[in-house]
Amino acid sequence: QCKILRCNAEYVSSTLSLRGGGSSGALRGGGGGGRGGGVGSGGLCRALRSYALCTRRTARTCRGDLAFHSAVHGIEDLMIQHNCSRQGPTAPPPPRGPALPGAGSGLPAPDPCDYEGRFSRLHGRPPGFLHCASFGDPHVRSFHHHFHTCRVQGAWPLLDNDFLFVQATSSPMALGANATATRKLTIIFKNMQECIDQKVYQAEVDNLPVAFEDGSINGGDRPGGSSLSIQTANPGNHVEIQAAYIGTTIIIRQTAGQLSFSIKVAEDVAMAFSAEQDLQLCVGGCPPSQRLSRSERNRRGAITIDTARRLCKEGLPVEDAYFHSCVFDVLISGDPNFTVAAQAALEDARAFLPDLEKLHLFPSD
């Protein structure tokens, strides 16, 4: 079986240690400088040579797959970029995964794959949680309660940290429309210690599998494999992924031909990223150049603004950001079913937000 993801994870782990703990992303190489002079010189080249060796060893079982060719070309580019020679030392095998906060205290060891329990034992209080969501055109609610409507096209990262990578791929809702809708979601749960093998989940419109890419429904054969699980209450329209080892719950829904993403994640996990991973819609919201104001909506189809408001008001009585995004979506798409996406996003926020006072956000424009 193709184990290229293991090579990717080992490379990420080895560059993590070079950069003092920040993740480099699977093929970013961590940039030029890095702490301690490791990255950009001998350290990164050793890691890249190890990565190249690992991918070469997977060639027999991966050579026909995209992940293999992406890795091969990525390594090639990075070796050229960092002037690495083909011959030379390789990195030692990396540790199994990033350590969770509080490791090493004198308390009896809590279950390393139960983030909440472990955090509570080590800190004497439950962890803090953050919520982010993307739905509709897409509208993004960031961890910091910014609410933006984005015109992003193509693939954009919602999250990119040491534990999780979430990418949404969007395309225009209709010919000539500024607004876009999410058609595909890719989630990578990164290899971690004794808890999980690296797992990839991909959802596309009309294809919400209740399994990871490798067909499994948990984190693999490691002792804590059950700390990552996937289930559904409504096949084809809803998937819930529980990642107890990082205190995370993700909900993916399909409504009106688009995908919605919602996450509740432990604060330390959400914030475990480096400067190179600065583009995350869940962290910074949409980049200013990619934001749509409500004045930019262009109606399509026969739905008037009054009808859209009435349709949205039924499920969203408070005229908050969810209500306004619902009106926006219904107007632009001409599809009343878009009310469901905003309603579901509000329900997820109600379930996921630690502070319900922040449930209703009110847009400034």
């Epitope: 079986q1 193709c2 060796l53 070469r56 060893r57 027999r60 079982t61 991966c62 050579r63 026909g64 797959d65 995209l66 992940a67 293999f68 060719h69 991909q202 596309e204 294809n207 599998p209 399994a211 890419e213 490798d214 067909g215």
Partner: antibody, heavy 115, light 112 residues
Framework: EVQLVESGGGLVQPGGSLRLSCAAS????????MNWIRQAPGKGLEWIGM????????HYADSVKGRFTISRDNSKNTLYLQMNSLRAEDTAVYYC????????WGQGTMVTVSS | DVVLTQSPLSLPVTLGQPASISCRSS???????????LEWFQQRPGQSPRLLIY???TRFSGVPDRFSGSGSGTDFTLKISRVEAEDVGVYYC?????????FGQGTKLEIK
């Protein structure tokens, strides 16, 4: 859930042609190499060939080289096997399977070559 | 081409008893990097093949732990620690180390 559904099998005369299809769902088809494997009645498994995720390379067993062609349409999540110059010994159940090395298989489609 | 020879071709087993299938290769399946790419498939009556074991000894997702694989070089073994009724079918070894990939001729496991 990974699903592969083969179709297009049937009865064909020696020397004839047939095109098999394999509809894929439950995984990102365009990310994976794909294989065709066959099984003659009451016999073992025989690998026929494989195609890379982007169709850039194809590999075939000597027994079908020059007669069979594997192709794919990633926009339709479909794998194909074009079989020409068919012989009696090509009679078999034909399976498509996911991955450079096959992990998930379809249920198969029967091809009978007989006059 | 690499020839994989399985034995026995037929294996009658009592329910609850262990079973062992051998697969011998005409040449070493160890690659130049030291990896060995040998897999085992199960084909139940009337069904398509299902992957059980890859890389000689790693169980595929969802495969019960009563199945185990071992071996190196040219000699490989699939073991079932306690045979259950659902294990009836034909078992194939499959090598990926050398082109073209090849299957063993199959071993039919039946209940005594």
């Amino acid at each position: 859930e990974v699903q592969l559904v083969e179709s297009g099998g049937g009865l064909v005369q020696p020397g004839g042609s047939l095109r098999l299809s394999c509809a894929a769902s439950g995984f990102t088809f365009s990310n994976y190499g794909m294989n065709w494997i066959r099984q003659a009645p009451g016999k073992g498994l025989e690998w026929i060939g494989m195609i890379y995720y982007d169709s850039s390379e194809k590999h075939y067993a000597d027994s079908v080289k020059g007669r069979f062609t594997i192709s794919r349409d990633n926009s339709k999540n479909t794998l194909y096997l074009q079989m020409n110059s068919l012989r009696a010994e090509d009679t078999a159940v034909y399976y498509c399977a996911k991955g450079t090395t096959p992990d998930y298989w379809g249920q198969g489609t029967m091809v009978t070559v007989s006059s | 081409d690499v020839v994989l020879t399985q034995s026995p071709l037929s294996l009658p087993v009592t329910l609850g008893q262990p079973a062992s299938i051998s697969c011998r290769s005409s040449q070493s399946l160890e690659s130049s990097d030291g990896d060995t790419f040998l897999e085992w498939f199960q084909q139940r009556p009337g069904q398509s093949p299902r992957l059980l074991i890859y890389d000689v000894s790693t169980r595929f997702s969802g495969v019960p732990d009563r199945f185990s694989g071992s071996g190196s070089g040219t000699d490989f073994t699939l073991k079932i620690s306690r045979v259950e009724a659902e294990d009836v079918g034909v078992y194939y070894c499959f090598q990926v180390t050398h082109d073209p990939v090849t299957f063993g001729q199959g071993t039919k496991l039946e209940i005594k």
